[in-house]
């Protein structure tokens, strides 16, 4: 019951994450122009990574397309390349995890292969929320760079003003979604992983059987027909090998390694 | 690149009219942002207007608000500016300027600029 809660948990925190993830790659406020010790102007600019957008005091906004791809900062290429990586194996976890939850019966799948599947899935999900944490993080940095860049290049104007010669930008609401959703993508991927080993089907699965002897004491060796006592042939020594250990087991046994020795 | 071309500059009387035009040679033209700056001996370069890509959003310095008007022909490549009521504080040399991603008052945001035109106002 609990592997199923927590294998169901971690699906739906991890289908939360990928979609945070995805809203996340298609918002357009990634950088959003720092007001502060700014000019009053009737505009504010905005970009994400597919496109720059420009809003108006009335509320009107125009945005428009990076269209150029050569023309774009390898780093946003870096990170454009890491959010997607991040969708598409969050995506084809999210397919894997389906078919992996125990609570829906497909066919006559074993619960081993439901346990690697759930593991596959939980290990997509945590390279997936790792690839969006680091896409939003390296956005970031770059941001933060640029933003104390553009404070050093400081100028005295005349009368002894200072202002900024380039706009600065600071961290969008985007970027918060995705180390959020990045988050819950990585969350989700761990209570996977430690719902796979509580799928997985025990390396030995035998109960425990004493054997009594009636009269003399017996010592049995897996050696053939053996059960010596230290007198020749003893009938209910073999009597006791041969019928004495019935378990519920033998009904349905698992095979181990022992089986084959 | 793009390289930018004032023209239209001129002596003209106070309360006089001009008509800038700045002539890009990118045909990429309606995928930037423009902008006029100008600069009067002795000062720095400041921020006359700028519009956007299609032209749906115009900003303008608080100095020739209502009195000056940015438009752009992108089929035409050039963005002009209207200059009506000039007044003798307006006299300098005008400057077309290019830039991708943003509509701001600042000169470091704009990637491309012209050679300029000069302006005069007599009074």
């Known amino acids: 019951m609990a592997v199923t809660a927590c294998q169901g948990l971690g699906f739906v925190v991890s289908l939360i994450g990928i979609a945070g993830i995805i809203a996340a790659t298609c918002m357009d406020q990634w950088s959003t122009q720092d007001l502060y010790n700014n000019p009053v102007t009737a505009v504010f600019n905005y970009q994400g990574l597919w496109r720059s957008c420009v809003r108006e005091s009335s509320g009107f906004t125009e945005c428009r397309g990076y269209f150029t791809l050569l023309g774009l900062p390898a780093m946003l290429q870096a990170v454009r390349a890491l959010m997607i990586v991040g969708i598409v194996l969050g995506a084809i976890g999210l397919l894997v995890s389906i078919f992996a939850l125990k609570c829906i019966r497909i066919g006559s799948m074993e619960d081993s292969a439901k346990a690697n599947m759930t593991l596959t899935s939980g290990i997509m999900f945590i390279v997936s929320g790792l690839c969006a944490i680091a896409g939003v993080s390296v956005f970031a940095n770059m941001l933060v760079t640029n933003f104390w860049m553009s404070t050093a290049n400081m100028y005295t104007g005349m009368g002894g003003m200072v202002q900024t010669v380039q706009t600065r930008y600071t961290f969008g609401a985007a970027l918060f979604v995705g180390w959020v959703a990045g988050g819950l993508t990585l969350i989700g991927g761990v209570m996977m992983c430690i719902a796979c080993r509580g799928l997985a089907p025990e390396e030995t699965n035998y109960k425990a059987v004493s054997y009594h002897a009636s009269g003399h004491s017996v010592a049995y060796k897996p050696g053939g027909f053996k059960a010596s006592t230290g007198f020749g042939s003893n009938t209910k020594n073999k009597k006791i090998y041969d019928g004495g250990a019935r378990t519920e087991d033998e009904v349905q046994s698992y095979p181990s390694k022992h089986d084959y020795v | 690149q793009v390289q930018l071309v004032e023209s239209g500059g001129g002596l003209v009387q106070t309360g006089g009219s001009l008509r800038l035009s700045c002539a890009a040679s990118?045909?990429?033209?309606?995928?930037?942002?423009m902008g006029w700056f100008r600069q009067a001996p002795g000062k720095e370069r400041e921020f006359v207007a700028g519009?956007?890509?299609?032209?749906?959003?115009?900003d303008y310095a608080d100095s020739v608000k209502g009195r000056f008007t940015i438009a752009r022909d992108n089929a035409k490549n050039t963005v002009y500016l209207q200059m009506n009521s000039l007044k003798p504080e307006d006299a300098a040399i005008y400057y077309c300027?290019?830039?991708?991603?943003?509509?701001?008052?600042?000169?470091?945001?704009?990637?491309?600029w012209g050679q300029g035109t000069q302006v005069t106002v007599s009074s």
């Open positions: 300027a290019a830039n991708a991603i943003q509509l701001t008052r600042r000169s470091g945001d704009y990637a491309y």
């Open positions: 990118d045909s990429t033209f309606s995928s930037y942002i």
């Open positions: 519009i956007t890509w299609s032209g749906g959003i115009k």
